[in-house]
Interface confidence: low
């Protein structure tokens, strides 16, 4: 039907309803105007990566599939003006860096998603006029630094943010008019933005509020985009961000509830309305959950994806639904529930994974489920659960564990226990083996029936298991991922901690020197290491090598009289740094270099006089610092801090001063900058070396003379570690 | 933004105590300072103390010093405020309050009203 | 405790009207003052601080001068939303204290 010459192929006007196959793999430029093509799928351009012009315009498209374009790396020039296109799928041009021209006008678009042009940085020409456009997310233009020209004229937008058209510096074409603009003080931006501007823009009028109607928004004053108090007082002073809403083809949206059920769907719908609070996907054939899939539903309370044929799960498949109550997951192939799957999903009460494939569960699998109710794995492949998976549901009531193939030997005695005392598993889970215990329940076996043969320790080592592991360590106590080695006179850390540890309890013990073992490079999961309550005084440089995960340290109560930053080499995640009650007197300007990620540092109890300037200026995402409990001396040297806690106006607790007596114990952050001062000998900055002498002194180990030099006033820079202090023969009349 | 919700109007007996909650909602407010202010009818505004909920510690103004305990659950993001040995002039409206520093008060819960009546 | 003294404390005004409601510290509190602004029934708004900063959302229309012991709170051009009780208060010292609060009603 088409025609082709040399590397243009012509298949406008044949009254096509999809996109022939066949194309020829060199083919440049693409001819399919004029047809009646509904749909374009992700195989339609499959291999045409030579493709440079494809035109799609005036034909009956409303549905783009996602990766429909991937494989058009040289695609320049696309037109899909005159179609029914209502969705504007986000990364469509992912793939296609080169395109410069771009035409979707006389379409029916209602909105912009933020991620629409991702990809397609080099375009020059956008054409979305004549759409039915009333948003535009932010920043979906932001990577289209090149535009020159965009036509948005005809649409129904009401607002846009400055953001979306401040980094466009070749625009030299620019419509806008033939909108519903709303002049309110969101939009008094434009009016600037337009003045800036002459030649772009003509013709942007005002359609409301009423008093400004017609009127040119360049001519407005800034003055009279006005907001109502109660918008106003509003604590975003933004416009109000819209959001891409629409409820996808063949499913039915109402009351803030989307009915996909039976729809054939092959994958989450992208771009639903991000109030809605419950998705129905059930009886559909979706795969895969890819990561984020609901992240913007922040409102989502309920969400049915039963009946599928999901097998594989992203980590953060649920990431962000704190609010979700129910869970339903039965009636699919899922083997194993990735690390971290229901992490945050504090708000669930029902989850539903019964009739899967599961063959194992991580023993943190559920931690964050403190409200769940109900929990089903009925009729699975569970041989073994670890002892701890189940106890941070404080809230269960309900658990339905038959119809797995358990073996109950020494690894599962903890469950019958765990039954016996809480009589939640109403299914009456049994037995497979061993031979003599098989069909029995597992609530009604006495516990010491649960045996293993041979010495195998208190791990599962079934192959079915997620993580074949290290035995626990002597003198340590392992529980779920949390090993317990606090209380036993430790002074270094033990060998063979297991892999999967996420807790590393070391607290209490007689550590005096952290050592730089490499201990942590075998612990991938750990996230947190309580040191506290140890006589630490050293921590070795690349003591914390290989801790790139762990986010939270504790190191209360040690001995630490100096922190340095390459004691904390390594700890790139870090968040939480507890120092509290050492014996740290200075920290100094390079102290916590490299700790970019942490948000609470404590160092509340200590002897701290001085920081030395900037020493908190790495920590980009500190938000709280404890700095109470210690003597700081506002001389000249703390000038900074005082400043700085005012500007940065981060949670500190309002540290204060001890020195000099006419600022004891005023707030640092409170005091005059012009009454740090080093007047009258304050001049002490104890991240100065220690062991100067003053010039008119002399010194002999901490032995420090200054007999008869005629002195008014107490030399500066005594050492700190001063024993003897000879003062005799000069002429104070004050006690320094 | 944080949004403070406060529990519901009270009645007491003088000599008894009250358990004012204000729970956060929009946010999580562990690291930031969370305030109870009164107001007695037709009065004037009066801070009665503070805490923030991760250093655990409450700061209180030493008119209220062993009447009012103020505690905070991280958990449930809700602080609390007791105020024990109830007086009719403690009759008022009790406001708890976050913000940026101890003692600025960005955002402000509905308020309880407390009324102490024989 | 540092105390706070506001006046008047009331005042009739017409909307247009450029109102000022000033506050005193009893002792130097640098330009630590924040204004509240409190409809009856209704919890205070934080509406300034640091003696001069708008809070995000404030109409423009108010203001804030002031160091030391003397502070001003300013509105260019009374609006209807605006009649309401202002509240002075000091962040440089534990207790916080609030001055008594100016009553601005409609003349």
């Known amino acids: 039907q088409c025609s082709c010459s040399g590397s243009t192929v012509d298949c406008h006007g044949l009254a096509l309803r999809i996109v022939p196959r066949n194309i020829p793999r060199n083919t440049e430029r693409l001819d399919l105007n004029g047809n009646n093509i509904t749909r374009i799928t992700k195989t339609d351009f499959a291999g045409l990566r030579h493709l440079r012009i494809l035109q799609l315009m005036e034909n009956k498209i409303s549905t783009i599939e996602r990766g429909a374009f991937h494989d058009l790396k040289e695609l320049e020039r696309l037109r899909l003006n005159r179609n029914n296109l209502q969705l504007f799928p986000e990364l469509l041009f992912l793939g296609t860096a080169k395109l410069y021209r771009l035409d979707l006008s006389e379409n029916q678009i209602q909105a912009i998603p933020r991620k629409a042009f991702r990809g397609a940085v080099d375009i020059k020409n956008l054409q979305l006029d004549y759409n039915q456009i009333s948003c535009i997310e932010d920043g979906a233009f932001r990577a289209l630094r090149d535009l020159e020209v965009l036509t948005l004229n005809n649409n129904n937008i009401t607002r846009l943010s400055v953001a979306s058209f401040n980094h466009m510096p070749k625009l030299r074409t620019f419509r806008l008019h033939s909108n519903n603009l709303y002049c309110d003080c969101h939009l008094a931006w434009l009016s600037d933005w337009l003045r800036q501007r002459p030649r772009v823009g003509l013709y942007t009028q005002c359609m409301g509020p009423s008093h400004l109607r017609g009127h040119n928004v360049a001519e407005v004053q800034k003055r009279e985009f006005v907001c109502s108090d109660e918008e106003e007082g509003h604590q975003s002073f933004m416009a109000p961000s819209c959001s891409v809403l629409h409820c996808p083809i063949a499913c039915t949206c109402s009351n803030n509830i989307v009915d996909c059920r039976g729809k054939g769907l092959t994958e989450i719908p992208t771009n639903l309305p991000e109030t809605i609070t419950e998705i129905r996907l059930e009886q559909n054939s979706i795969r895969v959950i890819p990561p984020g899939a609901f992240s913007p539903y922040k409102k989502l309370r309920r969400l049915d994806l039963s009946n599928n044929q999901i097998s594989e799960l992203a980590p953060d498949a649920f990431q962000g639904l704190r609010s979700l109550n129910s869970l339903v997951l039965y009636g699919n192939k899922i083997t194993e529930l990735p690390k971290s799957l229901f992490e945050g999903l504090f708000s669930l009460q029902l989850l539903l994974l019964n009739a899967n494939k599961i063959n194992c569960l991580r023993v943190d699998a559920f931690q964050d489920l403190h409200n769940l109710n109900l929990l089903s794995l009925y009729d699975n492949k569970l041989q073994t659960v670890a002892k701890g998976t189940f106890s941070a549901l404080r809230a269960i009531q309900t658990m339905h564990l038959a119809q797995n193939p358990f073996i109950c030997d020494c690894h599962l005695k903890w469950l019958a226990d765990y039954l016996h005392t809480n009589p939640i598993e109403t299914s009456g889970a049994r037995c497979t083996s061993p031979r003599r215990l098989a069909n029995k329940r597992i609530g009604q076996i006495k516990s010491k029936k649960f045996r293993c043969s041979g010495t195998e320790d208190y791990r599962s080592k079934l192959s079915g298991d997620c993580f074949a592991d290290l035995a626990c360590p002597e003198k340590c106590r392992c529980e779920g991922t949390t090993v317990d080695c606090s209380n036993q006179k430790l002074n270094k850390i033990p060998d063979h901690i297991p892999q999967y540890t996420a807790e590393l309890r070391l607290n209490n013990n007689e550590f005096t020197v952290l050592e730089a073992t490499g201990i942590f490079k075998k612990l991938p999961q750990l996230r947190k290491i309580n040191l506290s309550n140890n006589k630490i005084t050293d921590i070795e440089e690349g003591a914390f090598e290989g801790a790139s995960g762990v986010n939270e340290i504790l190191l209360t109560s040690n001995r630490l009289e100096n922190v340095q930053h390459k004691m904390f080499k390594g700890l790139e995640s870090l968040k939480t740094l507890m120092l509290r009650s050492n014996r740290i007197s200075c920290v100094g300007n390079d102290s916590f270099t490299g700790l970019g990620s942490v948000r609470l540092l404590s160092l509340y109890d200590n002897q701290i006089t001085t920081v030395a300037p900037g020493a908190f200026g790495t920590l980009h995402s500190l938000s709280t610092l404890n700095l109470l409990a210690n003597p700081f001396n506002c001389n000249c040297h703390l000038a900074w801090l005082g400043e700085w806690l005012r500007r940065k106006r981060i949670v500190t607790g309002n540290p204060r001063c001890q020195k000099p007596y006419f600022l004891k114990e005023i707030p640092i952050q409170d005091v005059a900058i012009q009454d740090f001062t080093c007047d009258d000998g304050n001049d002490d900055n104890s991240c100065s070396p220690l062991s100067r002498c003053p010039s008119e002194c002399t010194c002999l180990d901490t032995v420090v003379r200054c007999s008869n030099k005629g002195l008014k006033v107490l030399p500066k820079g005594i050492p700190r570690d001063v024993t003897e202090l000879y003062l005799d023969g000069n002429q104070f009349t004050l006690v320094p | 933004q944080v949004q403070l919700v406060q529990s519901g109007a009270e009645v007491k007996q003088p000599g008894s105590s009250v358990k004012v909650s204000c729970k956060a909602s929009?946010?999580?407010?562990?690291?930031?300072?969370v305030s109870w202010v009164r107001q007695a009818p037709g009065q004037g505004l009066e801070w009665m103390g503070g805490?923030?909920?991760?250093?655990?510690?409450?700061n209180y103004a030493q008119k209220f010093q062993g009447r009012v305990t103020i505690t905070a659950d991280e958990s449930t993001d809700t602080v609390y405020m007791d105020l024990s040995s109830l007086k009719s002039e403690d009759t008022a409206v009790y406001y708890c309050a976050t913000g940026s520093g101890w003692y600025t008060f960005d955002y402000w819960g509905q308020g309880t009203l407390v009324t102490v009546s024989s | 405790d540092i105390q706070m003294t506001q006046s008047p404390s009331s005042l009739s005004a017409s909307i247009g009207d450029r109102v000022t409601i000033t506050c005193r510290a009893s002792?130097?509190?640098?330009?630590?003052l924040n204004w509240y602004q409190q409809k009856p029934g209704k919890a205070p708004k934080f509406l300034i601080y640091?003696?001069?900063n708008l809070q995000s959302g404030v109409p423009s229309r108010f203001s804030g001068s002031g160091s030391g012991t003397d502070f001003t709170l300013t509105i260019s051009s009374l609006q209807p939303e605006d009649f309401a009780i202002y509240y002075c208060q000091q962040s440089y010292r534990s207790p916080p204290t609030f001055g008594g609060g100016t009553t601005v009603e409609i003349k």
């Open positions: 002792q130097n509190i640098n330009a630590y």
């Open positions: 805490i923030i909920p991760i250093f655990g510690t409450a």
């Open positions: 929009g946010g999580s407010f562990r690291s930031y300072t």
């Open positions: 640091a003696a001069s």
